[in-house]
């Protein structure tokens, strides 16, 4: 039994996999910031987690996926104030009782030191200094990402 947030996450990821082939992104679009091989868009408005997820999808991007501690630190360095929280693409999967990235992978416990509870309706936010579990209904800012790559995107055929 999947929660509504899990279903939303899966639906959006599947729809992204079904998009037509297009060239890889060579440069970051206007208003997006380059961080290594990614383009990041830091929202100025606030939304619950699932609306943030949907917003990134409409921008042909995804909520931020963080590979490791190093990428986390570099992302946090771009946050201008300690009192801003941003949603990323990680939430608690009730069915699997674990933190799950929106690409379907599970959190490596060494990657992020999460402050707060791992429980139903918990989603992950980052600040300038820390990583927090917040209620997914909380309205905060969010970060979208686009992969910066010269190669063509892999296309998944419609099923």
């Amino acid at each position: 039994q999947k929660s509504s947030i899990e279903k939303c996450s899966v639906d959006i990821q599947q729809s992204r996999n079904k998009t037509t082939e297009r060239p890889g992104l060579l440069n970051c679009p206007i208003y997006w910031q380059q961080l290594r091989e990614k383009c990041l868009l830091f929202s100025h408005t606030v939304n619950p987690w699932n609306n943030s997820l949907a917003d990134c999808s409409t921008k042909e991007s995804s909520l931020l996926l963080i590979r490791d501690k190093d990428e986390l630190i570099h992302t946090q360095n771009l946050i201008r104030d300690k009192a801003i929280l941003f949603w990323i693409g990680l939430n608690f999967s009730l069915s699997e009782k674990n933190w799950k990235w929106i690409n379907g992978s599970f959190l490596n416990s060494n990657d992020l030191e999460i402050r707060g509870d791992a429980k139903e309706n918990s989603c992950i936010s980052i600040s300038q200094t820390s990583v927090y579990s917040e209620y997914c209904s909380t309205e905060i800012r969010w970060i979208c990402q686009k992969e910066l790559t010269p190669v063509r995107n892999k296309v998944y055929p419609d099923s």
Partner: antibody, heavy 119, light 107 residues
């Protein structure tokens, strides 16, 4: 209807401690950042401290750092402010307000509780 | 810290008057500016958020404008219940700071 009701104010000697409470109702408390804002007699508004919805993240004005601690109990829909090493200049009406993480405005306020620090 | 300065500190006006209060920020705060009304002995009340958005339930005679460093609160036709103190506040960066207030009195 959103309601915020502060309590715990009173007269305390310099160097003393006090714990303020704010009982919230009418909204999903755990989904909102909360703040304490104070107003000295006849003066303007001064933000004191804020906490995220989960309570995991907190931050303070310089005047409160090291002396005040903000916390919340989401199971009781209650916000707290533990005030230690109180000074005469902490005398004020303390308001509980909803909001406090950028770019939140304070959209609901309690009526306030008066803290008087005097010997 | 970002300093917020309001002008005037006080003003006298009559019912029906158009009233304008100005708020300046010591650095650019984009549109992260809120306006509050406080009646004597009461808690502040949010009027305008994000510089120009009217808070739900607030009469349309209140309006806000501006961005960057200069902001204005306008009351198009002053009503008896509008005699109060008005504060601007920035939510661009911490610490959150308020203007010193503008007291609107009856002429």
């Amino acid at each position: 209807e959103v309601q915020l009701v502060e309590s715990g104010g009173g007269l305390v000697q310099p160097g003393g401690s006090l714990r303020l409470s704010c009982a919230a109702s009418g909204f999903t408390f755990s989904s909102y950042a909360m703040s304490w804002v104070r107003q000295a007699p006849g003066k303007g508004l001064e933000w004191v401290s804020a906490t995220s919805g989960s309570g995991g993240s907190t931050y303070y004005a310089d005047s409160a750092k090291g002396r005040f601690t903000i916390s919340r109990d989401n199971s009781k829909n209650t916000l707290y402010l533990q005030m230690n090493s109180l000074r005469a200049e902490d005398t004020a009406v303390y308001y509980c307000a909803r909001g406090g993480y950028l770019p939140d405005a304070f959209d609901y306020w309690g009526r306030g509780t008066l803290v008087t620090v005097s010997s | 810290d970002i300093q917020m300065t309001q002008s005037p500190s006080s003003l006298s006006a009559s019912v029906g008057d158009r009233v304008t209060i100005t708020c300046w920020a010591s650095q650019s705060i984009s549109s992260y500016l809120n306006w509050y009304q406080q009646e004597p002995g009461k808690a502040p009340k949010l009027l305008i958020y994000a510089a120009s958005s009217l808070q739900s339930g607030v009469p349309s005679r209140f309006s806000g404008s501006g961005s960057g460093t200069d902001f204005t609160l306008t009351i198009s036709s002053l009503q008896p219940e509008d005699f109060a103190t008005y504060y601007c506040q920035q939510t661009y960066s911490t610490p959150l700071t308020f203007g010193q207030g503008t007291k609107v009195e009856i002429k």
